[in-house]
């Protein structure tokens, strides 16, 4: 499939101009190669009309230009003084005309409307409102006011001042007569339909002295905005429908065959199953505008999208709409990464998150997608050292392996951890990826005690048993904190006796804490890694208490009877700071991470699409 994309249809009127934008993957080769616009012949060839190398056909001399925008991966063809002869099938493309790196464009140039003299032209977008103004003279002030629509050869009454309304306009039309000072009446038509377009006549009085005014109503179907995004990337649709629909339900739908438009998401709580876990509808502003973010773009997401407002939360005739044509570029710069990661209860997962390697200094985030209301994604951890309180000791975001990938480790898994998670940064908003974590039956491979109590001033030894399948991996112990997990020295104590059917390659690796202090209290992880890639981890909470009797402590698995999440923290263990971060780029250049932390209320950190507050402390 060609990665070139442009408008499928371009419509214009004789004498006017058009501007056609074509998109291409902005590789260095593509940026510098020839760009062209050619007309398709009946026998299949394509005759160049204009190219980026300076060629301009005599047919286009003085009325067309082609401009390349290599930094955007686009080029634009402008054609002026259009005539009906320009109607036809064209291609915009890269390289040589016959190579197939092109996109087919149909250009339709129609005759301008033949209008009667003194005709007022009203050009209004589909779904919007038009006000047709009708002047009259004093002698007709008390007479019947009416509006007719020309259907074929005959005028058909639409509305009059005696209360008649044509059934096609019921509930969406009114006739206003201005105060006595103004000799004007107006007809207001709401929720305009394509079928409303045409010639109208307004009239005051019914005899030969009546006042008449011609009006031509043109209802414009919105031209779709072209959107070119990478496979596996993210797209944001910004929908601004105007304050008049601020309180009406909003929707985003995708056009299927014919005129059908299947709801993708709406503000009434509907969401298409194919978008589960990868869509957020950003709440509306007072002016009725909203935005929808879709991550993890798939080939099948390509197509025409409409956003609109209607009480039903779906497209109806007369809904005000905005349109986009989404092209998903399969020559993606976004690397493949697993869309599903499975973990066992009590065990752990390590998720690789891609980011734009040009933005290595950007802040990395991981959030949990929530489907309630319009969807939201409360932050769980960031690369600046913030971790949501409920995840202390079991969640870490690591900059490794770097060069366009960071790692998130989550351990002590429970069934509640199943769900969709988003990887994102405060840089390139297109690089948002989604991963689903599934919790399956099984046993963790690493064996550690449940929780451990150390005595001040004494020595503590904590074991971690590694099965033989991990023999080729580096084994480590580290102390968890909110910026990561700091490696600690550990001792290899030889083969472990904790595994059945496991040879000499199993290992018991112990963490030793000498002369325990209060600072040693906290979460410790043992784990395996291969270079910069992290594997399984297991967590142990070490509590520190006053000395009762002398000696050192050697913790065995037999003593490990407490559940992994039975952790008792001092009341002053973490002070919740009163800070806020707000980065408008994180959520489609608006309302991004609202991470307000308050000592009274706990905290909230979210890539948000709802207004509910997320309670619970945080650690910095």
């Amino acid at each position: 499939k060609s990665p070139i994309f442009g408008p499928e249809e371009v419509n214009s009127v004789e004498g006017n101009s058009v501007s056609i934008t074509c998109y291409y993957p902005p590789t260095s080769v593509n940026r510098h190669t020839r760009k062209y616009w050619c007309r398709q012949g009946a026998r299949g060839g394509c005759i160049t009309l204009i190219s980026s190398e300076g060629y301009v056909s005599s047919k286009y001399a003085g009325r067309a230009n082609l401009t390349n925008f290599p930094e955007n991966g686009t080029f634009v063809v402008n054609i002026a003084q259009l005539s009906q002869d320009d109607s036809g099938r064209y291609k915009c493309g890269l390289g040589i005309n016959s190579r197939g790196l092109s996109f087919d464009v149909s250009l339709e140039v129609s005759q301008g409307p033949g209008l009667l003299n003194d005709t007022k032209v009203y050009t209004v977008d589909l779904g919007r409102t038009v006000t047709i103004n009708c002047p009259f003279k004093t002698e007709n002030a008390q007479k019947r006011k009416s509006l007719y629509k020309q259907i074929g050869l005959y005028p058909v009454l639409v509305i009059d001042s005696s209360g008649y309304v044509n059934p096609n306009y019921t509930g969406r039309i009114r006739l206003d007569i201005q105060g006595t000072g103004q000799l004007l009446f107006s007809v207001v038509i709401n929720q305009l339909r394509l079928s409303d377009a045409g010639q109208y006549l307004c009239q005051a009085g019914d005899d030969s002295n009546s006042n008449k005014k011609n009006a031509d109503l043109q209802v414009l179907k919105p031209e779709p905005e072209l959107v070119y995004e990478d496979l596996r990337g993210s797209v944001t649709f910004h929908c601004a429908l105007g304050p008049e629909v601020a309180n009406v339900a909003k929707f985003l739908c995708r056009q299927s065959s014919g005129e059908n438009c299947d709801v993708v998401v709406n503000t009434l709580g509907k969401r298409a199953p194919a978008f589960e876990g990868r869509i957020l509808l950003n709440p509306q502003d007072k002016d009725g505008s909203f935005s929808v973010v879709i991550t993890g773009l798939r080939k099948e997401d390509a197509g025409r999208y409409l956003c609109g407002a209607h009480s039903d939360g779906q497209l109806q005739e007369g809904s005000p709409i905005q349109a986009w044509q989404l092209f998903v570029n399969e020559e993606s710069t976004i690397p493949r990464s697993p869309t599903v990661v499975k973990g066992v209860a009590g065990g752990s997962v390590a998720v690789l998150c891609p980011y734009n390697r040009k933005e290595s200094k950007s802040i990395k985030y991981w959030c949990l997608w929530e489907g309630a209301q319009n969807g939201r994604c409360p932050l769980l951890v960031d690369s600046e050292g913030w971790v949501k309180a409920q995840y202390e000791g079991r969640l870490s975001l690591l900059e490794e392996p770097g060069n366009g990938t960071f790692t998130v480790i989550l351990n002590q898994l429970t069934s509640r951890d199943a769900g969709f998670y988003w990887c994102l940064t405060n840089g390139d908003t297109l690089w948002r990826t989604t991963v689903e974590i599934k919790i399956i039956e099984g046993e963790p491979n690493l064996k550690v005690p449940g929780n451990v109590t150390a005595v001040l001033g004494e020595t503590l030894k904590v074991p971690c048993h590694f099965p033989c399948k991990f023999s080729s991996y580096e084994k480590y112990w580290c102390k968890w904190n909110n910026t990561g997990c700091q490696a600690l020295p550990s001792q290899d104590e030889g083969p472990s006796k904790a595994f059945v059917n496991c040879d000499e390659n199993s290992r018991l690796v112990s963490l030793t804490l000498n002369l325990v202090t209060r600072a040693d209290e906290g979460w410790y992880w043992c784990g395996v890694k291969q270079g910069h890639f992290y594997g399984e981890t297991a967590a142990v909470y070490v509590a520190v208490e006053e000395r009762k009797a002398a000696g050192s402590r050697d913790v065995s698995l037999a003593k490990a009877d407490a559940a992994p999440d039975e952790k008792v923290l001092d009341s002053g263990f973490r002070e919740i700071e009163n800070k806020a971060i707000q980065d408008p780029r994180l959520f489609a250049e608006e309302k991004a991470v609202a991470d307000t932390r308050d000592q009274a209320d706990g905290s909230r950190a979210s890539v948000d699409s709802g207004s509910s507050e997320e309670q619970g402390g945080s650690s910095r």
Epitope: P335, R336, S337, P338, T339, V340, V341, K342, G343, V344, G347, S348, V349, A350, L352, T407, I440, G442, N445, K469, Y473, V528, K529, Q530, G531, F533, Y534, G535, E536
Partner: nanobody, 124 residues
């Protein structure tokens, strides 16, 4: 029953090439990872390369990067390790292994299923 069978090993001169195959059967899932490991006499087992079936991503140990290429034929349920520019230090028994769950990036995966191995000897 899950089975992994390696083939393609043999004796080759330094600078030569070999292609190892790992045929997998008995899997009821399609998102597993296959890794290649090697063990030289008297040495620890060493991870060489892996491929994630779910997304096609591939990884290599620094010692083989640029010389070895891992690939997969999903229709045949077979993973290949193309080894070029072989060196005497590549001499080992090469095992393929499968990570059936995929909780971790495949270089650090949990490999529960192992093949018997195929001997690769590189003479100088």
């Amino acid at each position: 029953e899950v089975q992994l069978v390696e083939s393609g090993g043999g004796l080759v001169q330094a600078g030569g090439s070999l292609r190892l195959s790992c045929a997998a059967s008995g899997f009821t899932f399609d998102d597993y990872a296959i890794g290649w490991f090697r063990q030289a006499p008297g040495k620890e087992r060493e991870w060489v390369s892996c491929i994630s079936r779910s997304d096609g991503s591939t990884y290599y140990a620094d010692s083989v990067k640029g010389r070895f290429t891992i690939s997969s034929d999903n229709a045949k349920n077979t993973v290949y390790l193309q080894m070029n520019s072989l060196k005497p230090e590549d001499t080992a028994v090469y095992h393929c292994a499968a990570d059936a769950i995929g909780s971790f990036p495949c270089p650090a995966g949990v490999y529960d299923y192992w093949g018997q191995g195929t001997q690769v000897t590189v003479s100088s």
